[in-house]
Interface confidence: low
Amino acid sequence: RPSFSLVEDTTLEPEEPPTKYQISQPEVYVAAPGESLEVRCLLKDAAVISWTKDGVHLGPNNRTVLIGEYLQIKGATPRDSGLYACTASRTVDSETWYFMVNVTDAISSGDDEDDTDGAEDFVSENSNNKRAPYWTNTEKMEKRLHAVPAANTVKFRCPAGGNPMPTMRWLKNGKEFKQEHRIGGYKVRNQHWSLIMESVVPSDKGNYTCVVENEYGSINHTYHLDVVERSPHRPILQAGLPANASTVVGGDVEFVCKVYSDAQPHIQWIKHVEKNGSKYGPDGLPYLKVLKHSGINSSNAEVLALFNVTEADAGEYICKVSNYIGQANQSAWLTVLPKQQAPGREKEITASPDYLE
């Protein structure tokens, strides 16, 4: 449901899928549930700092402490995961730094980084002491429920001993777990008594049971895996951009829009225009003209460049960014001065591209 009318004579090529949109990912801070997390806002000369999470203002509460340039989250839960931003407001400008918080039980790679050579798990028994299987490290088995974001790697461990050395097999939902049951299969590291699944998907959800047995007995332990699909959010635009600008008649000017979006964003540059001497259509909505959008023929849609401007180019320029979740827009004003008047920038913006898409 668009909230504007497009000028009828605006010539736009048919909507094309946006070009591959390059962004540098914000820094990611990882914490396990229950841990405390402290993040320092990496902005210099910050007089006043405000914080947001997923684009919504973040205030202090019984678990969130905001002290100076520090954000502390006590007893983190998966609901604390998301895109955070701190904005430093100064007298002349403002600057925003984005970072991700990921509160998850999942290990971050397919390697057994918490294992050494596995010697502490692989117990050698004296051949005379026959013994049924037993767990050698129950601490590594305490957490039965694993909620893991999609695409992460999961490792389940059942360190055991016995004589003769027990064998280990894995069941999924009570049935034999075969390699062909999942795309990419899985790894079993017998020396580490572990099952590893890389790049989990929702169909990996279920109960995983290790069965450890020898001729004297059998023991088993069940883990529950829940695969959480990532919830994208609507685009977030860097505060203060695009910035107001002024130039003389015949001069050139650039507006810049910095976007963070974890779903494919579509950028439009829009300007209010007049039609038949009116700024508004019969429905009361303003006439808008799309000057540029991130279609296949657009280069660097984040930047709108205007060359050889005239007085008619003065006015409000809107950067509108949408993805399939929602949209965001911010605007700036262009002032066009007579040639004899020297232009002065209304805002001094020092925006680093390092932390934004």
Epitope: P202, S231, R234, Y324, I325, G326
Partner: antibody, heavy 122, light 107 residues
Amino acid sequence: EVQLVESGGGLVQPGRSLKLSCVASGFRFNDFWMTWIRQAPGKGLEWVASITYTGDNTYYAGSVKGRITISRDNAKSTLYLQMNSLRSEDTATYYCTRDDYGGYSPYYMDAWGQGTSVTVSS
Amino acid sequence: DIQMTQSPSSLSAFLGDRVTITCRASQDIGNYLRWFQQKPGKSPRLMIYGATNLANGVPSRFSGSRSGSDYSLTINNLESEDMAIYYCLKHNEYPFTFGSGTKLEIK
């Protein structure tokens, strides 16, 4: 224009089955979770079931768990609700709505179908 | 499960009045709360998302606010077209729960 059109409702006897459909148009169906909501005559709204983009994960209200199955066919942009062992308390208008578990999305439940009426009676 | 207690169950007000409807959550749900309007014989319509954000096309006389576990929908300058039943919905986790509804009538 975003449109959701439900069908498949009707009069059915207790213990029997019924399958509802919801055809979506005007948006990228496989980019959204989808949800069924129902409303008994003269009563309030009740969440019934939700399904993820791919259909791999499904979620159900306790009152329908084990009797009702939500599914989707992304190629046909269609959402389904298979209702088995129907009871009189399942009598309601069933609405489908597009969903986004992301929380603050303005598109979350912003589009609803016109509803399809299910009456369970002998 | 988290309970949503909506009040009042019905409300009668004059045109031009300011009315407020409240939902109380039994546990913390953050800002994961929405408000819907349903007119007789019609499908529900999203009015407020994220506890405080106005949905597309909703008149600015509608607003949402939060104070702790209490969430409010306020209508300023009541108009005849606002006569409807209003529901809150919490959606921080499954199962999603609607409030019982508030029937708003015009005196």
